[in-house]
Interface confidence: medium
Amino acid sequence: MMTGTIETTGNISAEKGGSIILQCHLSSTTAQVTQVNWEQQDQLLAICNADLGWHISPSFKDRVAPGPGLGLTLQSLTVNDTGEYFCIYHTYPDGTYTGRIFLEVLESSVAEHGARFQIP
């Protein structure tokens, strides 16, 4: 039975040209994590495999950095990076757990003045 749960950073926003860390955390299971895939729509961004180590897909290697931990850092963000990102945890013996993150990349001025992060 799959008892684990994936906690993610949820819906996040970041400035165009900036960077963002995508993080997922698998909890409530003793299953062994054998591989984590990071995917965006139909494209594989990166793999972190227990045996293979990190592998960044060629089309993203200039803008994607592994870590921290099993997370992924996206750099030099563009508006086209807006969308859904998935962390896919392959585990043994449980199977596959998936977390979803929605990233919105905003023009600098919008991000600076976004109500979501304003401090009174």
Epitope: Q35, D51, L52, G53, H55, F86
Partner: antibody, heavy 120, light 113 residues
Framework: QVQLVQSGAEVKKPGASVKVSCKAS????????IEWVRQAPGQGLEWIGV????????NYNEKFKGRATITADKSTSTAYMELSSLRSEDTAVYFC?????????????WGQGTTVTVSS | DIVMTQSPDSLAVSLGERATINCKSS????????????LAWYQQKPGQPPKLLIY???TRESGVPDRFSGSGSGTDFTLTISSLQAEDVAVYYC?????????FGGGTKLEIK
């Protein structure tokens, strides 16, 4: 263009080892995982294992663990698959393949295949 | 390991007719989180390596004619050739790329009737 050129046919005696090479060209060798797949005469396809040429990390089909060793030489852009303790049922065509960015198990680029015959 | 079972083992179809090949996996290849099926179809002609036709159960690889289509989800998948051409004579394989070890079906040999 992308090319994977494999070494020539081999005839081996039972108990011996064979080392098949796969020389890559037309792309950055460390950017893509290299997989090995075999096909016995008149049979289907069997996945042997994978290497990340960037890190040297490997992952094997449990069936081949301890008998197959996959390595990569970055200086010559060549991947190798060595199979030891050969038996007659290892007679097969051995293929190397390169995945593409839609997923870590899809192989649009293949070597031409290397025929390994195990016979006393 | 995920076991992939193809049917039929062989199939004879007239030129211009529809050919249908089925593939069943022992575990679901659907990732419910992103709604993607991790299933691919390959075509192999004698003396050649396999050629990727379809991935994600239904997405054609670039350059593959649109008479080839894939469908299905979870554990049941189908490859359809809408109008068989002489050059389609080959063995067709389905493949799990959901989890290691990647496993292939036993193959379906397609011939002209």
């Amino acid at each position: 263009q992308v090319q994977l050129v494999q070494s020539g046919a081999e005839v081996k005696k039972p108990g011996a080892s064979v080392k098949v090479s796969c020389k890559a060209s037309g792309y950055a060798f460390t950017d893509y995982l290299i997989e090995w797949v075999r096909q016995a005469p008149g049979q289907g396809l069997e996945w042997i294992g994978v290497i990340n040429p960037g890190s040297g990390g490997t992952n094997y089909n449990e069936k081949f663990k301890g008998r197959a060793t996959i390595t990569a030489d970055k200086s010559t852009s060549t991947a190798y698959m060595e199979l030891s303790s050969l038996r007659s049922e290892d007679t097969a065509v051995y293929f190397c393949a390169r995945y593409h960015y839609y997923g870590s198990g899809l192989f649009p680029y293949w070597g031409q295949g290397t025929t390994v015959t195990v016979s006393s | 390991d995920i076991v992939m079972t193809q049917s039929p083992d062989s199939l004879a179809v007239s030129l211009g007719e529809r050919a249908t090949i089925n593939c069943k996996s022992s575990q679901s290849l659907l990732n419910s989180g992103n709604q993607k099926n991790y299933l691919a179809w390959y075509q192999q002609k004698p003396g050649q390596p396999p050629k990727l036709l379809i991935y994600g159960a239904s997405t054609r690889e670039s350059g593959v004619p649109d008479r080839f289509s894939g469908s299905g989800s979870g554990t049941d998948f189908t490859l359809t050739i809408s109008s068989l051409q002489a050059e389609d004579v080959a063995v067709y394989y389905c493949q799990n790329y959901h989890s290691y070890p990647f496993t292939f079906g036993g193959g379906t040999k397609l011939e002209i009737k």
